[in-house]
């Protein structure tokens, strides 16, 4: 049974097995196609989600289609239901929480009152001034906070308590990526870990250890990653794992908060890594004990410079290390969390290339999240 | 593009009133507070008072309270402002103003051109 | 009311110079302080609000800094457009009041 599973996958109607190697592979081996169902699936950027959070004390703004303009949600006439249309326009399935902040004296955008037309948010055409001066800030999931602080030293073993939303995606029981708890059905990680097998039935998730082997694995019931754009090849380097049963929260199995859409980090800015990747260069051998280092912001111009990266890093990216090199993310991270603190953490980068591990002038690459939360908003809707 | 467009210049008596109008285009009226600032010649500006065109609730300063109405017509997307028992002292340029955003606290992003009104016997 | 004092009550500078007017509160008004410029005959024009953010369309060249009580508008290089007369205004508590004004000639 065993060897059968791991060779043979099994067709129905009529019953007969085929190779595994031919599972997701883009020719249909079994009569009803199902070899071709449980597959890394990609998914479009879509539409713009209407509704966004800022870094200002997590404010809900909300656009105006016929304009394209966004404008901040007064809090005259919030409500309950009002938060939850909110947070559903952006995916989030669990109970929202929120409050009135006051309107600051160097507040932007111009402030609507706030309604529902179809599951929608929209403003309120008949709506008078913003009365309460008061803006709405909104938490759509408890999400970023540790049972520890790490601290802020060079490389050292890490603890599950610090962070508790790191996981280890597994090929066959084997590490492959690192990965980052975002709602008790989603993990965030990276597109590439995915090149080499592409069905979905043999990847598991690992939460809540910092040992590689010593914790459950979670069923996986889709991988989803964006459309390729041959353009730009090591764009989108970004993937969501649903799992198949919903993961329930713990102090060690908690979420990580998604960055705000105006997270701009500006160089020096001191970011988390972790991981159980190799802890040399073609080291050969994963770490089993879950790694962290504290690295900052490097500016993208330094970044792309010709003794670096000449023009490879996008937009859609970042660069983070130390300015002498020597601590970086490597093979076995991939997927992983680049991290920022604030009142939470945040997950601002995803650890996705770069050339060798640790050298001064080629520090990580990672995959931008503030880039694709209009991706991951349309992923978590198609799936709610 | 926002547009105030408000009434032409006044000559009144010691002791009478005068009505100026300020119309509003460019967005939506009652979405956003209304002030009225005036300026004597060769002066400053001293803020008089504040309209909410939603509802027609007013806000005035303590130096004009008795004095001073302000009042709208959303159908016109129109403010007024009318100050009465005049004397010299309130011959000044009159301004309506509304605010950069929607909160009654913040400056004033939005000016009209402005109404001389001429205090004289 | 708060007191908005302004200084100095006029300058005069040339084209391309650094030009500083300041504005003090009679009490904290945190950073709820605007910079308006008027020219003769015109209405006031938005510069600065939340004491240092730029009113979308104003050049680059004005700045404002300051909290509490204290507030500087910078003008780091004077352009002819420039001569105008400045008036800080408090929006942090009721009734909004505006300094006395700088004018700023050509020297």
């Known amino acids: 049974k065993v060897i059968l599973d791991k060779y043979y996958f099994l067709c129905g109607q009529p019953l007969h097995f085929i190779p595994r190697k031919q599972l997701c592979d883009g020719e249909l081996d079994c009569p009803l196609g199902e070899d071709e169902e449980h597959c890394v699936k990609s998914f479009p950027e879509g539409p713009a989600v209407a509704v966004r959070l800022s870094k200002d004390r997590s404010t809900l703004q909300v656009l105006d289609s016929a304009t394209g303009n966004w404008f901040s949600a007064c809090f005259d006439n919030f409500t309950e239901a009002l938060a939850e249309t909110a947070c559903r326009q952006m995916g989030y399935s669990s109970k929202p929480t929120f409050r009135a902040v006051e309107i600051g004296p160097d507040q932007d955008l111009d402030v609507v009152e706030i309604t529902e037309n179809s599951q929608e948010l929209r403003m309120r055409n008949s709506s008078g001034p913003c009365l309460s001066g008061s803006l709405v800030s909104l938490h759509c999931l408890a999400c970023g906070k540790s049972l520890k602080t790490p601290r802020v030293v060079g490389v050292e073993e890490a603890s599950v308590d610090s962070w508790p939303w790191q996981v280890s995606i597994q090929y066959d029981k084997q590490h492959v990526c690192g990965g980052s708890i975002l709602d008790p059905h989603w993990v965030l990680t990276a597109a590439h870990c995915f090149r080499k097998h592409t069905d979905v039935f043999n990847w598991k998730v690992r939460a809540g250890s910092d040992k590689l082997g010593s914790f459950p694995s979670l069923a996986v019931a889709k991988i989803i990653i964006i459309e390729f754009n041959p353009m730009y090849p090591k764009d989108n380097d970004i993937a969501l794992m649903k799992l198949q049963f919903p993961l329930t929260f713990s102090g060690t199995v908690r979420p990580i908060c998604l960055p705000f859409f105006d997270e701009e980090l500006t160089p020096a800015t001191p970011l988390w890594i972790i991981g159980w990747g190799f802890t040399k260069q073609n080291g050969g051998k994963m770490s089993d004990i879950l790694l962290q280092a504290s690295v900052q912001v490097i500016d993208s111009t330094r970044c792309n410079a010709d003794d670096a990266y000449q023009g490879e890093v996008t937009e859609k990216m970042m660069c983070a290390g130390i300015p002498e090199g020597g601590v970086d993310t490597c093979q076995g991270d991939s997927g992983g969390p680049l991290m920022y603190q604030s009142d939470q953490w945040h997950v601002v980068g995803i650890v996705s290339w770069g050339y060798g591990c640790g050298g001064p002038s080629t520090p990580g690459v990672y995959t931008k999240v503030s880039a694709y939360l209009n991706w991951i908003y349309n992923v978590w809707k198609a799936e709610l | 593009q926002v547009q105030l467009v408000q009434s032409g210049a006044e000559v009144k008596k010691p002791g009478a009133s005068v009505k100026v109008s300020c119309k509003a285009s460019g967005y939506r009226f009652t979405s956003q507070y209304m002030h009225w600032v005036r300026q004597a010649p060769g002066q400053g500006l001293e803020w008089m008072g504040i309209i909410n065109p939603s509802g027609g609730s007013t806000s005035y300063a303590q130096k004009f309270q008795g004095r001073v109405t302000m009042t709208r017509d959303t159908s016109t997307s129109t403010v007024y402002m009318e100050l009465s028992s005049l004397r010299s002292e309130d011959t000044a340029v009159y301004y309506c103003a509304r605010g950069r955003i929607a909160v009654a606290g913040h400056p004033l992003g939005y000016w009209g051109q402005g109404t001389l009104v001429t205090v004289s016997s | 009311d708060i007191q908005m004092t302004q200084s100095p009550s006029s300058l005069s500078a040339s084209v391309g110079d650094r030009v500083t007017i300041t504005c003090r509160a009679s009490?904290?008004?945190?950073?709820?302080l605007a910079w308006y410029q008027q020219k003769p005959g015109k209405a006031p024009k938005l510069l600065i609000y939340?004491?240092?953010s730029l009113q979308s369309g104003v050049p680059s060249r004005f700045s404002g800094s300051g909290s509490g009580t204290d507030f500087t508008l910078t003008i780091s290089s004077l352009q002819p457009e420039d001569f105008a007369t400045y008036y800080c205004q408090q929006a942090n508590s009721f009734p909004p009041t505006f300094g006395g004004g700088t004018k700023v000639e050509i020297k």
């Open positions: 009490q904290s008004i945190s950073s709820w």
């Open positions: 939340g004491a240092s």
